[in-house]
């Protein structure tokens, strides 16, 4: 079974800068999985943001600002990266990755 690790416990960024969050997949080939990213703002329910499927297809939640989030997959390091552009107050949250094994 696959296992996920988010090595950064926290990430502190200046407003308008870029944040990159990592999710390391082990126990399964990342190219054979879909990785999903979610965020949980303080006091709010968890929300789906973006996913990258086994074939590289990216799906973004409607209503999420365009250009705000980028998702990538690096097979060499078995890592999925969530990039948050122009960090703002609304981006303060806990971000979770999740795995769907194909």
């Amino acid at each position: 079974a696959g296992h996920l690790e988010q090595p950064q416990i926290s990430s502190t960024k200046t407003l308008s800068k870029t944040a990159r969050l990592e999710c390391v997949v082990s126990g399964i080939t990342i190219s054979a999985t879909s990785v999903y990213w979610y965020r949980e703002r303080p006091g709010e329910v968890i929300q789906f943001l973006v996913s990258i499927s086994y074939d590289g297809t990216v799906r973004k939640e409607s209503g999420i600002p365009s250009g705000k989030f980028e998702v990538d997959r690096i097979p060499e390091t078995s890592t999925s990266t969530l990039t948050i552009h122009n960090v703002e107050k609304q981006d303060i949250a806990t971000y979770y990755c999740a795995l769907w094994e194909v």
Partner: antibody, heavy 126, light 109 residues
């Protein structure tokens, strides 16, 4: 001195347009979310629209959605509200207001409008 | 849409008395997202309380906020002449609109 000054209000006919401006001074404008709030004279406050510091997150009240457009120019320290297809019920004093900034690096952050302009009157009448 | 209901509509009190203003949300609101404002005639509103209980800069300690979930309270421990005004609560939920209550007027008895 931290200050917000609105301009652009006036008398306009129903169906007409106006563009409100809000000039900010005394703080780093690009670090703050901004809001427009309106108030019919003698009545309560109504939130109209909000825009985040880098303009990624933009929200509108249902009553103005599709007619009003909020925008900002961080280089000019200015906030704008483009109001189209104006109706009689849009008649109000329009305030721009700064949202609370982020203090420290904590996950505990708050919302609230801590700096307000003096308001600009918009009258929609034939 | 979260509806904020304030009570009473008008509160008639004398200087030195304690004022208790209520704000009830139609659904649960995070304490981080609840604010109180004061507005005097001809003036813009002024932020009093944010995060349900934190006083804004320069606000005297006779003003205090409390509550959680759907019920919030603004208390003025001893009314000063300058405290007679209209008070509004406001919620910032997980999605707009960021609604205000209809206001409570505190006037001199």
């Amino acid at each position: 001195e931290v200050q917000l000054v609105e301009s652009g209000g006036g008398l306009v006919k129903p169906g007409g347009s106006l563009r409100l401006s809000c000039a900010a001074a005394g703080f780093t404008f690009s670090n703050y979310d901004m809001n427009w709030v309106r108030q019919v004279p003698g009545k309560g406050l109504e939130w109209v629209s909000s825009i985040s510091s880098s303009s990624s997150y933009i929200y509108y009240a249902d009553s103005v959605k599709g007619r009003f457009t909020i925008s900002r120019d961080n280089a000019k320290n200015s906030l704008y509200l483009q109001m189209n297809t104006l109706r009689a019920e849009d008649t109000a004093v329009y305030y721009c207001a700064r949202d609370l900034g982020i203090t420290g690096t904590t996950m505990d952050y708050y919302y609230g409008m801590d700096v307000w302009g003096q308001g600009t009157m918009v009258t929609v009448s034939s | 849409e979260i509806v904020m209901t304030q009570s009473p509509g008008t509160l008639s009190l004398s200087p030195g008395e304690r004022a208790t203003l209520s704000c009830r949300a139609s659904q649960s609101v995070s304490s981080s997202y609840l604010a109180w404002y004061q507005q005097k005639p001809g003036q813009a509103p002024r932020l009093l309380i944010y995060g349900a209980s934190s006083r804004a800069t320069g606000i005297p300690d006779r003003f205090s906020g409390s509550g959680s979930g759907t019920d919030f309270t603004l208390t003025i421990s001893r009314l000063e002449p300058e405290d007679f005004a209209v008070y509004y609560c406001q919620q910032y939920g997980s999605s707009p609109p960021y609604t205000f209550g209809q206001g409570t007027k505190v006037d001199i008895k």
